[in-house]
């Protein structure tokens, strides 16, 4: 889980001939806002279909009244981030559009009137946790210029947020094979229970023993690069080893087209493909209308008799979006309980309840520990619909069934031998270093003739502390 | 990467007391083990009082009943509260560490304790 950030820096009017009218009027007052919809992987999508990813609006604007005889200058613009929460991994790979709608605050009957302004989309590769991402866009004659970033929520780390960190449980170290969490060593990564072997760059899991592939890998262990054309492709050997090449450098690669469009290449040069309301050798020209249809999923069209005067979109019963697009998601209120899965199911909502669990909504707390026992003393603890024994000293695993190895963690320091003992281990150190982990080298100088050790870090052990 | 910064050297009287600072940073002093360690004019640095990053403590035989080492998790600081000094216990004082997650150690600049009359 995670959230996806968007910090519109400035919409006027792009570089060149041609400056747009501004949108605003000393006779019709005018706001703006954004709205940004995201939408998983690079393939290509129907303006159409759902934001899968998410979508956010903005707050308003200032109010901006258009000083009569200047040029359209950039607009005022709302505070603050657009964030769109993720529920599940980040898929590297994502398609955005970006909106910029008016909100007149003329004496119009009914309130004030919305119409779209600008709309970009494009493609983009984005680690999560990386830094903030800089981009312009060019709608028509208006500019639009945006940061972005991905970043995870606690407990999840990692490019694609699917690494957990978890408050360490022993207070020196982490647990055999597991890492410290950074900047500081008071969490550690959770167990990782993917399938074995599952590349941790490009796969990841939500449920023990599996492995899916995040955007652009495949094969069952998410190592193989999926190529964007096929292994044929004149720019890109095949490998047996890797599957197929990423094709060289050609005239689509970066997609010159704008706003969604798709390229195709041609014989001397590429061709675009528009969406819906945008027109122009890169799509970069945009008047969308009522009678381009924007409105999705039975949705009304107001007004937009010509590019000049936009549109507005009546939605009906569970759809919601300025294009309609977005089902509207019941499951969002998340009504289910202790973690239950929320269904839609459209006529009603169902909620699947984790084990431990149950009731309509997952309300009912079901006794854990009832009929289970812990093996060699020790105790059933509750707690998320799963049965845990914390075990006594020596013993490990789901029931304590299990002698745990004290010195399977390499407890002793600077090359000390462990030793398991009935009351947990012993360390004995190696010459030079003393103490009860042979944590504290004795004369840390050795044979240097050097009055004093510079300060600053001196490799110990420097092998990962596993 | 740890940093260690003492402080609270300085020349005392034979017999008197001094307390060094150890402030951490980069990790918490509840997951490192840290050290104190002495250095005379012409001599080899040397252990002088540990703890454990579980909380156990241990001194040289010359120190014992004499020096204290104690850790402040919310301060992040280790200290040493040294009393009835003697001539010899003038040396540089260091700040030591050992990270457990990176199996690293780290030292300090180090801080001056002269006793004389």
């Known amino acids: 889980a995670g959230v996806f950030e968007l910090q519109i820096h400035s919409f006027g009017p792009g570089p060149g001939p041609g400056a747009p009218r501004s949108p605003c009027s000393a006779r019709l007052p005018c706001r703006l806002f954004f709205r940004v919809c995201l939408k998983p992987g690079l393939s290509e999508e129907a303006a159409e279909s759902p934001c899968a990813l998410g979508a956010a609006l903005s707050a308003r604007g200032p109010v901006y009244t258009e000083q009569p005889g200047a040029p359209a200058p950039d607009l005022p613009l709302p505070d603050g981030l657009l964030q769109v929460p993720f529920r599940d991994a980040w898929p590297g790979t994502f398609s955005f559009i970006i909106e910029t709608w008016r909100e007149e605050l003329g004496d119009q009957i009914g309130g004030p009137a919305w119409s779209l302004l600008a709309r970009v989309a494009g493609r983009r590769r984005l680690a999560a946790g990386g830094p903030w991402a800089r981009d312009i866009q060019r709608a028509g004659a208006w500019e639009l210029r945006f940061s972005y970033r991905a970043r995870c929520e606690p407990p999840a780390v990692g490019t694609a947020c699917t690494r957990l960190c978890r408050p360490r449980s022993a207070p020196s170290r982490c647990g055999p094979g597991l890492r410290p969490c950074a900047p500081l060593e008071d969490e550690c990564e959770a167990p990782l229970v993917c399938r074995a072997g599952c590349s941790p760059e490009h796969g990841f899991c939500e449920q023990p023993g599996e492995c899916r592939c995040l955007e652009g890998w495949t094969g069952p262990l998410c190592t193989v690069p999926v190529s964007t054309s096929s292994c044929l492709s004149p720019r890109g050997p095949s490998s047996a080893t890797t599957g197929c090449l990423v094709p060289g450098p050609g005239p689509c690669d970066g997609n010159p087209c704008a706003n969604g469009g798709s390229c195709s290449e041609t014989p001397r040069s590429f061709e675009c493909t528009c969406p819906r309301g945008f027109y122009g050798l890169r799509c970069e020209v945009s008047g969308v209308t009522c009678a381009d249809g924007p409105c999705f999923n039975g949705g009304l069209c107001v007004g937009g008799a010509d590019p000049d005067s936009a549109y507005i979109c009546h939605c009906p019963p569970g759809f919601q979006g300025s294009n309609c697009e977005k089902r509207v998601d019941r499951c969002s209120l998340q009504p289910c309980r202790n973690g239950g899965l929320c269904l839609d199911l459209g006529h009603a909502l169902r909620c699947r309840c984790r084990a431990g669990f149950a009731g309509p909504r997952c309300e009912h707390d079901l006794d854990d520990c009832a009929g289970r026992a812990c093996a060699n003393g020790g105790t059933c603890v509750e707690g998320g619909g799963a049965h845990r024994c914390s075990c006594a000293l020596g013993f490990g695993g789901r029931d304590c069934r299990e002698r745990a190895d004290p010195c399977a963690a390499r407890p002793c320091a600077h090359g000390g031998r462990c030793y398991a003992h009935f009351s947990g281990l012993v360390c004995a150190c190696a010459p030079g270093y003393m103490g009860a982990r042979c944590e504290f080298p004795v004369h840390p100088d050795g044979a240097s003739a050097l009055p004093a050790a510079p300060p600053g870090l001196r490799p110990g052990d420097p092998q990962r502390y596993l | 990467e740890v940093q260690l910064v003492e402080s609270g050297g300085g020349l005392v009287q034979p017999g008197g007391s001094l307390t060094l600072s150890c402030a951490a940073s980069g990790s918490r002093v509840s997951f490192l083990s840290m050290a104190w360690y002495r250095q005379a004019p012409g001599k080899k640095r040397e252990l002088v009082a540990g703890i454990s990053a579980d909380g156990s403590t241990g001194y040289i035989d010359s120190v014992k009943g004499r020096f204290t080492i104690s850790r402040d998790n919310a301060k992040n600081s280790v200290y040493l509260q040294m009393n009835s000094l003697r001539a010899e216990d003038t040396a540089v004082y260091y700040c030591?560490?050992?990270?457990?997650?990176?199996?690293?150690?780290?030292w300090g600049q180090g801080t001056l304790v002269t006793v004389s009359s």
């Open positions: 030591y560490a050992y990270r457990w997650a990176t199996r690293y150690t780290y």
